[in-house]
């Protein structure tokens, strides 16, 4: 069987010879050199060599426990002649003993940490950690103690844990923001002869809201023209706050003053300025100066600092409204006028009125924008704004005329304004009714009396208020002895009826019927229209088979006998 115990070896051996580890030995070894000892495993043949005859093991190199604390090797004892193992292969351990050859090393060369300003004494800042590569299970080589080398009286460190805490009351960021603390970690429990390492901790005081906003001046004055539309910026005011970030954010508001309804203040988030803007239209002629009270406040307030006073400040803003020469103002936004279509030239339609709103009340002259009245149908009295016709109108040509009137200050022609005029042309009965289409019909030779051969329709360009009412009749010259009659249907239509039984196309192939159409308006308008009736041969169903076309080719002299 094998005869050995666990081998121990001191690290960092500095002797000139190889370091003796121990002896492998089998009780089968007769000491005659018949056995060969073989070493395999961690570092065999390199770090550890064996005398194959005696089993003595030596370390060839300086060993570092921190690099490798334990080596696991295997031993064989073999009969040199046969190769036959005299013992089972066995595993053994070489354990490296620790010396204090490593200083504590911080996990970071430089730590960065933050803590709120004005923190209570003992507030946690950061924990630093140093590790010592030496053996923590043996002696105090790896027992680390922390101390502060730089950074008192502001900060302290817990010796066992490395926790850094605040040590001074009311540390004010606005006074000093950055601190550099140096911490030492020493092994051997901090005793003499221990190895040490240091780290730097850069501590930044973070801001808290312990400063109110302050206006640098108590009064601001701005000017703005009365023409400034709502939303126009007038000026900027800025309060300063010694804090930073959201603790320095400022909200501006108008709290008082006669301009409370006329102006707004908005906060520019980028610059933290208050922008005074116009809220409602200004009028120099009504009010020339406004006074506002503007307040700057922190939206986020820390209750524990309220004892320092209110976190707001106010300033007075004086706004001077400047006069602006304004264009004339019409009495209406638009005018609607009416005129009959039979109005004579120079007939007055109506009038427009415009006034200079300025205190000067400059006189105004009127004109028609000719781009809107190219045909010069209308004109205006430049002095009093009366609108009149300069040409005859026709409702049936154009019902509405849309023109623009310009009012210009006589003393300052650059100041002008415009207003739309909508002129409606009213209807007059000045058009006679007429046939809706050209009528050409036929009658069968074998037609019976009182047979309807055509229905007549009429149209009228006029547009009477109560609607059209047409009447139809044969012209007086054709009324007696006519071969056809006109029947007025009293619904703005009429029918042509046969008056006898049978027509002979060889005797008379075409009839021309003059029909009088009248309207029912004032003054009555009428016209005469002619209906052509051809006599045709028809089948027994009344369908036309053939007609003479002479009436179309030679219409003269054919109206007689209708």
């Amino acid at each position: 069987s094998w005869m050995w115990n666990q081998f121990f070896l001191l690290e960092e051996y500095t002797g000139s010879d190889y370091q003796y580890v121990g002896k492998l030995h089998s009780d089968q070894d007769r000491g005659d050199g018949s056995l060969k000892y073989i070493l395999s495993g961690d570092g065999a043949g390199d770090l550890f060599i064996i005398n194959e005859n005696t089993g003595d093991i030596q370390a060839t190199k300086r060993l570092d426990r921190e690099e490798k604390p334990v080596y696991i090797l295997r031993a064989q004892a073999i009969n040199r002649r046969t190769g036959r193992p005299v013992e089972p292969e066995s595993e053994f351990i070489i354990k490296i003993h620790d010396i204090n050859d490593n200083e504590p090393i911080f996990t970071k060369e430089v730590y960065t940490a933050t803590v709120p300003e004005m923190s209570d004494v003992g507030t946690f800042v950061v924990q630093v950690t140093a590790t010592d590569a030496d053996d923590p299970t043996y002696g105090n080589s790896a027992k680390v103690v922390y101390s502060i080398l730089q950074g008192q009286p502001y900060f302290s460190v817990e010796s066992e844990t490395g926790i850094i805490k605040t040590a001074l009351l009311n540390m004010d960021r606005e006074n000093r923001e950055q601190y550099q603390v140096v911490i030492q970690a020493k092994d051997m429990g901090g005793q003499m002869g221990g190895l040490s390492g240091t780290t730097t901790v850069n501590i930044t005081l973070t801001d808290v809201n312990d400063n109110p906003p302050r206006f640098p001046q108590s009064t601001y004055q701005f000017k703005t023209p009365e023409s400034s539309p709502p939303g126009t910026p007038i000026g900027r005011i800025k309060a300063s706050d010694a804090d930073v970030g959201e603790n320095a954010e400022i909200e501006y508001s108008i709290t008082d003053g006669e301009g409370l309804d006329m102006f707004d203040v908005i906060t520019d988030q980028e610059t933290q300025e208050g922008i005074i803007t116009v809220k409602k239209l200004l009028d120099f002629e009504k009010k020339k100066v406004y006074t506002l009270k503007v307040e700057a406040s922190n939206p986020y307030v820390e209750p524990r600092f309220l004892y320092l006073g209110p976190f707001k400040d106010s300033a007075t803003v004086r706004i001077v409204v400047e006069d602006v020469d304004e264009p004339p103002v019409f009495s209406k936004l638009a005018y609607i006028l009416q005129i009959r279509e039979d109005a004579q030239i120079n007939t007055t339609i109506g009038s427009v009125t415009a006034q200079d709103p300025d205190a000067a009340r400059n006189p105004v002259k009127y004109s028609v924008d000719r781009h809107t009245d190219m045909d010069r149908i209308f004109n205006i009295d430049s002095g009093n704004g009366s609108i009149f016709t300069s040409k005859l109108l026709d409702r049936e040509t154009l019902l509405w005329h849309n023109i623009t009137v310009i009012a210009t200050e006589i003393n300052n022609p650059k100041q002008s304004s415009r207003v739309p005029l909508y002129i409606k042309v009213l209807d007059v009965n000045d058009n006679a009714p007429e046939f809706a289409e050209f009528y050409e019909t036929f009658v069968c030779e074998k037609a019976k009396a009182d047979q309807l051969i055509q229905t007549l329709h009429a149209v009228d360009k006029d547009d009477p208020y109560s609607g059209h009412q047409f009447s139809f009749s044969l012209a007086p010259e054709a009324a007696s002895g006519s071969n056809f009659t006109i029947q007025d249907n009293k619904d703005n239509t009429a029918g042509i009826l046969t008056r006898k039984n049978g027509y002979n196309r060889h005797e008379m192939s075409t009839y021309l019927l003059p029909v009088v159409i009248s309207d029912n308006d004032y003054p009555v308008q009428s016209s005469t229209g002619t209906v052509t009736v051809r006599v045709c041969a028809c089948d027994h169903h009344g369908n036309m088979q053939s007609c003479h076309a002479e009436a179309l080719i030679h219409p003269t002299g054919l109206s007689t006998g209708a």
Partner: antibody, heavy 117, light 111 residues
């Protein structure tokens, strides 16, 4: 470089003896056993015996125990194998071989021994 | 004595083929995880050359296409891809017990 150089071929009469030498170089002669193996024409390998040069301890196969003698001269790093009472069936190539943990890692070039009347 | 039975006694294979030779010992040649079986190559007119020792260990300088395995009584020698220069007779040998004995040999030829 390890080398084993054997003596030259021998022709012997039946009943006589033969002594074959094997000179070693390129290693520590005393640290390794020396073995003798023979091979009859067209036949396989046959182990005859071995010697520990440091103590002259020998082992022989039963077949040759009475006829074979293995010796060494440490001063010249030479091993010898003597076979007596030769017969025709002893005609073979005789090899010396270095032994290391039961294996033959280096061999001599072989010596042909012919037994003929 | 431990008898070594090697098979086949001869074989013919093509270049690139996988060749396997077996050797059976009449009793176990293994102890404490060490297998005292070794393999040799012998070319005509030349002494044998050690290829594999202790059943599976490749001797220094021997090509990796040669390998060995096995334990106790049954052992295998393999050429993974036969090459023309591998034409030879191959022997197994045990050193477990005196007298040390060889297998009868396997002659390997190229088809």
């Amino acid at each position: 470089e390890v080398q084993l150089v054997q003596s030259g071929a021998e022709v012997k009469k039946p009943g006589s003896s033969v002594k074959v030498s094997c000179k070693a170089s390129g290693y520590t002669f005393s640290n390794y056993w020396m073995h003798w193996v023979r091979q009859a024409p067209g036949q396989g390998l046959e182990w005859m015996g071995d010697i520990d040069p440091s103590h002259s301890e020998t082992h022989y196969t039963q077949k040759f125990k009475d006829r074979v003698t293995i010796t060494v001269d440490k001063s010249t790093s030479t091993a010898y194998m003597e076979l007596s009472s030769l017969r025709s069936e002893d005609t073979a190539v005789y090899y010396c071989a270095r032994g290391d943990l039961g294996r033959f890692d280096y061999w001599g070039q072989g010596t042909t021994v012919t037994v003929s009347s | 004595d431990i008898q070594m039975t090697q098979s086949p006694s001869s074989l013919s294979a093509s270049v690139g083929d996988r060749v396997t030779i077996t050797c059976r010992a009449s009793e176990s040649v293994s102890i404490h995880g060490t297998h005292l079986m070794h393999w040799y190559q012998q070319k005509p007119g030349k002494p044998p050359k050690l290829l594999i020792y202790a059943a599976s260990n490749l001797e220094s300088g021997v090509p990796s296409r040669f390998s060995g395995s096995g334990s106790e009584t049954d052992f295998t020698f393999t050429i993974s891809s036969l090459q023309p220069e591998d034409i030879a007779t191959y022997y197994c040998q045990q050193s477990f017990e005196d007298p040390w004995t060889f297998g009868g040999g396997t002659k390997v030829e190229i088809k």
